[in-house]
């Protein structure tokens, strides 16, 4: 392991479409990938009239957008589907939305999802 870097070996797994996709609904996902490439966790969700609906959580392949991010934070302004990625085991358990362009308080607080 490289000093100062959180290696990702497992992530929280969730799939809202688990029946259609024939997967588990929730659990812990071991992250696989080329041995020299970095691995990350991700979370995707929707904001339906102020209610957070998780779409998917799991492992994410080597992505410079995720490097050295210990927290899962979406910074894009009002995307249709929110996405964040991070490094470190289970770092996608919590995710937040802090749009970069906002000057005022963020529109939503950090979320600790409770899958249905």
């Amino acid at each position: 392991a490289i000093l100062g870097r959180s290696e990702t070996q497992e992530c929280l797994f969730f799939n809202a479409n688990w029946e259609r996709d024939r997967t588990n609904q929730t659990g812990v996902e071991p992250c696989y990938g080329d041995k020299d490439k970095r691995r990350h966790c991700f979370a995707t969700w929707k904001n339906i009239s102020g209610s957070i609906e998780i779409v998917k959580q799991g492992c994410w392949l080597d992505d410079i957008n995720c490097y050295d991010r210990t927290d899962c934070i979406e910074k894009k302004d009002s995307p249709e589907v929110y996405f964040c990625c991070c490094e470190g085991n289970m770092c996608n358990e919590k995710f937040s939305y802090f749009p970069e362009m906002e000057v005022t308080q963020p529109t939503s607080n950090p979320v600790t999802p409770k899958p249905p």
């Epitope: 995707t44 779409v55 492992c59 994410w60 392949l61 992505d63 410079i64 249709e80 589907v81």
Partner: antibody, heavy 115, light 111 residues
Framework: QVQLVQSGAEVKKPGASVKVSCKAS????????INWVRQAPGQGLEWMGT????????SYAQKFQGRVTMTRDTSISTAYMELSRLRSDDTAVYYC????????WGQGTLVTVSS | QSALTQPASVSGSPGQSITISCTGT?????????VNWYQQHPGKAPKLMIY???KRESGVSNRFSGSKSGNTASLTISGLQAEDEADYYC???????????FGGGTKLTVL
């Protein structure tokens, strides 16, 4: 093993649209991006855009804005690239590639635009 | 984002070393370690050789190496072999906040 299998060659008339598919296997489709790249005959590689396979979020090269649409169907691990208002200079081999590093590539789809 | 600049062609004899350059700007090549190198044989899809400036892709010979100085990335192939004859492209990471761009390509001839 990771594989990206693309749809077959297409012949289109100027002004028409073409939709190329890219079916992924051997890895979790929703764990990365799919990028699209084209190569005109005897020319270099040209990046067209990318789609985040889990969120569906897209980024397109400025040159193709308004003419290209990238989508995906996670239930069948397939990404699509549709190019509209085709011109003769869109004749090229179109490739899909996995991830931000383009570490695996499809075999390519030849699109010929001719009247 | 403008294309990266590569020499149109380079050549070398078997056993020699050659270097292919890829010049960008301070905002792409110069500021981040996200340049990749691809090999393409005629009629085939490109193949990732080097990613993140200097990391060798799994299964790629250690005769291939990558480096960067300022706004220029370089691919060095040592101990040239006949099968190295191909087109080589540099390119950048693409996804999320990053837009992709490729160099114009360099034709390597093994004499």
């Amino acid at each position: 093993q990771v594989q990206l299998v693309q749809s077959g060659a297409e012949v289109k008339k100027p002004g028409a649209s073409v939709k190329v598919s890219c079916k992924a296997s051997g890895y979790t489709f929703t764990s990365s991006y799919i990028n699209w790249v084209r190569q005109a005959p005897g020319q270099g590689l040209e990046w067209m855009g990318t789609i985040n396979a889990v969120s569906g979020s897209t980024s397109y090269a400025q040159k193709f804005q308004g003419r290209v649409t990238m989508t995906r169907d996670t239930s069948i691990s397939t990404a699509y690239m549709e190019l509209s208002r085709l011109r003769s200079d869109d004749t090229a081999v179109y490739y899909c590639a996995r991830g931000g590093w383009f570490d695996y590539w499809g075999q390519g789809t030849l699109v010929t635009v001719s009247s | 984002q403008s294309a990266l600049t590569q020499p149109a062609s380079v050549s070398g004899s078997p056993g020699q070393s050659i270097t292919i350059s890829c010049t960008g700007t301070s905002s792409d090549v110069g500021s981040r370690n996200y340049v990749n190198w691809y090999q393409q044989h005629p009629g085939k899809a490109p193949k990732l050789m080097i990613y993140g400036v200097s990391k060798r892709e799994s299964g790629v010979s250690n005769r291939f190496s990558g480096s960067k100085s300022g706004n220029t990335a370089s691919l060095t192939i040592s101990g040239l072999q006949a099968e190295d004859e191909a087109d080589y492209y540099c390119g950048t990471f693409a996804g999320g906040d990053y837009y992709g761009v490729f160099g114009g390509g360099t034709k390597l001839t093994v004499l």
